[in-house]
Amino acid sequence: GELETSDVVTVVLGQDAKLPCFYRGDSGEQVGQVAWARVDAGEGAQELALLHSKYGLHVSPAYEGRVEQPPPPRNPLDGSVLLRNAVQADEGEYECRVSTFPAGSFQARLRLRVLVPPLPSLNPGPALEEGQGLTLAASCTAEGSPAPSVTWDTEVKGTTSSRSFKHSRSAAVTSEFHLVPSRSMNGQPLTCVVSHPGLLQDQRITHILHVSFLAEASVRGLEDQNLWHIGREGAMLKCLSEGQPPPSYNWTRLDGPLPSGVRVDGDTLGFPPLTTEHSGIYVCHVSNEFSSRDSQVTVDVLDPQEDSGKQVDLVSAS
């Protein structure tokens, strides 16, 4: 007869490990007992369990409550056992010794491998601002056994660097993603992808990029100068900019206070029916936590009774 087992049994942390040991005997042969022991190199054998043809299953005190026989039906030549709720410390070499009649004793060894799936974490880097050089966008760390693979999935152009730390029974892998921040990256996903044999599918953690910037400011509303004449209703100036975080707007008049009746509504300056009092230099001030911008325009309200044309100067400053 001969023993059938596996060279390696692989389980995920917390699962039950079936340790196979089957005696393929000739007809008339009987198995008296199957003794299981842990036999790691450099350490004495530690008894696990005994499957006895008459006495049944005995579990050694160190494994009490953790070793069982597979559920029925059972073949009397099958000496396999279940090790419940595998932990990392269970990883190692195991031996089954089968005592048969009349053929004598046989033994076989297997290695139990316990996979520890990683629990990845993603940590964003410092605040990203347009104009910075190469900057850390995020780092992703995953620890497991064996060492997990950490990669990045993104449309954003950048560079990655990885390092790993080996522990006694696991390894931690950290990957960093660096980029040169630009406003086009704002709102783009940056996804850390962790692969491991103990995972049914890759684990993904997504970080949305936020790049602080503030665009140049400009003012719209004076495109048709002839519309700015005395008595006109509904005239308005709109300040144009964009930024992250979204900017706030403030309107002032360079040559004095805002005329009465002029309404400030965020980025828009609304005028009552125009009079010559509304002529002047208006400044739009745009700011966010990152920067600030100014744009100024000169409004010249025309008197239709005058023949002279209106002149408008547009000046932008930052």
Epitope: G32, A35, E47, L50, Y55, H58
Partner: antibody, heavy 126, light 107 residues
Framework: EVQLVESGGGLVQPGGSLRLSCAAS????????MSWVRQAPGKGLEWVSG????????NYADSVKGRFTISRDNSKNTLYLQMNSLRAEDTAVYYC???????????????????WGQGTLVTVSS | DIQMTQSPSSLSASVGDRVTITCRAS??????LAWYQQKPGKAPKLLIY???SLQSGVPSRFSGSGSGTDFTLTISSLQPEDFATYYC?????????FGQGTKVEIK
């Protein structure tokens, strides 16, 4: 025919010592695990100590741990029990017994006692 | 330690009676259980091992059953020589422990 013959019992004062012997014959002594079991007058059976074939696995009842020592000499086919610091509650008939040999090379398990000696009386009294 | 509880502690029966003695373990012991017979002034004698296996030379009127925690010794037809004290013993853990005994007396 399997025979186990105990000797060495007797009267001893509290705190004293005795050494019990058990001479085995009729079987290959070195192939079997052995045990000592005692029975106080009018009481039930109490397992005292056991020793595996090669002396590798030795166990004691908590009541005698640190005071009694089991040993064997396979060349003389003899089992021993050295009893020190004896107490009145150690008074009993001490039996030497052979363990049934149907479990091999597994020290965590002891087996049934298939042959017993006639016993030797140990009396601890002042 | 595993506690072994026998019942009854004593019983009176007549020759030819069917006698049943039970033994309960404080935790599961598979079939690591033996039954012994002891007569006054004599050493115990192994009757049953592995809960239900008859020791060589023991009459077939003795039988054992059970596994886990509950076990039974049955004498199918009591004979005069069967009047004695009977002990169960677990050997699943060290120390092996005995029940307190059941004395079978003549009615």
């Amino acid at each position: 025919e399997v025979q186990l013959v105990e000797s060495g019992g007797g009267l001893v004062q509290p705190g004293g010592s005795l050494r019990l012997s058990c001479a085995a014959s009729g079987f290959i002594f070195s192939d079997f695990d052995m045990s000592w079991v005692r029975q106080a007058p009018g009481k039930g059976l109490e397992w005292v100590s056991g020793i595996k074939q090669s002396s590798a696995g030795i166990n004691y009842a908590d009541s005698v741990k640190g005071r009694f020592t089991i040993s064997r000499d396979n060349s003389k086919n003899t089992l021993y029990l050295q009893m020190n610091s004896l107490r009145a509650e150690d008074t009993a008939v001490y039996y030497c017994a052979r363990e049934y040999s149907d479990v091999v090379d597994y020290v965590s398990v002891r087996t049934p006692l298939d042959y017993w000696g006639q016993g030797t009386l140990v009396t601890v009294s002042s | 330690d595993i506690q072994m509880t026998q019942s009854p502690s004593s019983l009176s029966a007549s020759v030819g009676d069917r006698v049943t003695i039970t033994c309960r373990a404080s935790q599961g012991i598979s079939s690591y259980l033996a039954w012994y017979q002891q007569k006054p002034g004599k050493a115990p004698k192994l009757l049953i091992y592995a809960a239900s296996s008859l020791q060589s030379g023991v009459p077939s009127r003795f039988s054992g059953s059970g596994s886990g925690t509950d076990f039974t010794l049955t004498i199918s037809s009591l004979q005069p020589e069967d009047f004695a004290t009977y002990y169960c013993q677990q050997h699943y853990t060290t120390p092996p422990t005995f029940g307190q005994g059941t004395k079978v007396e003549i009615k």
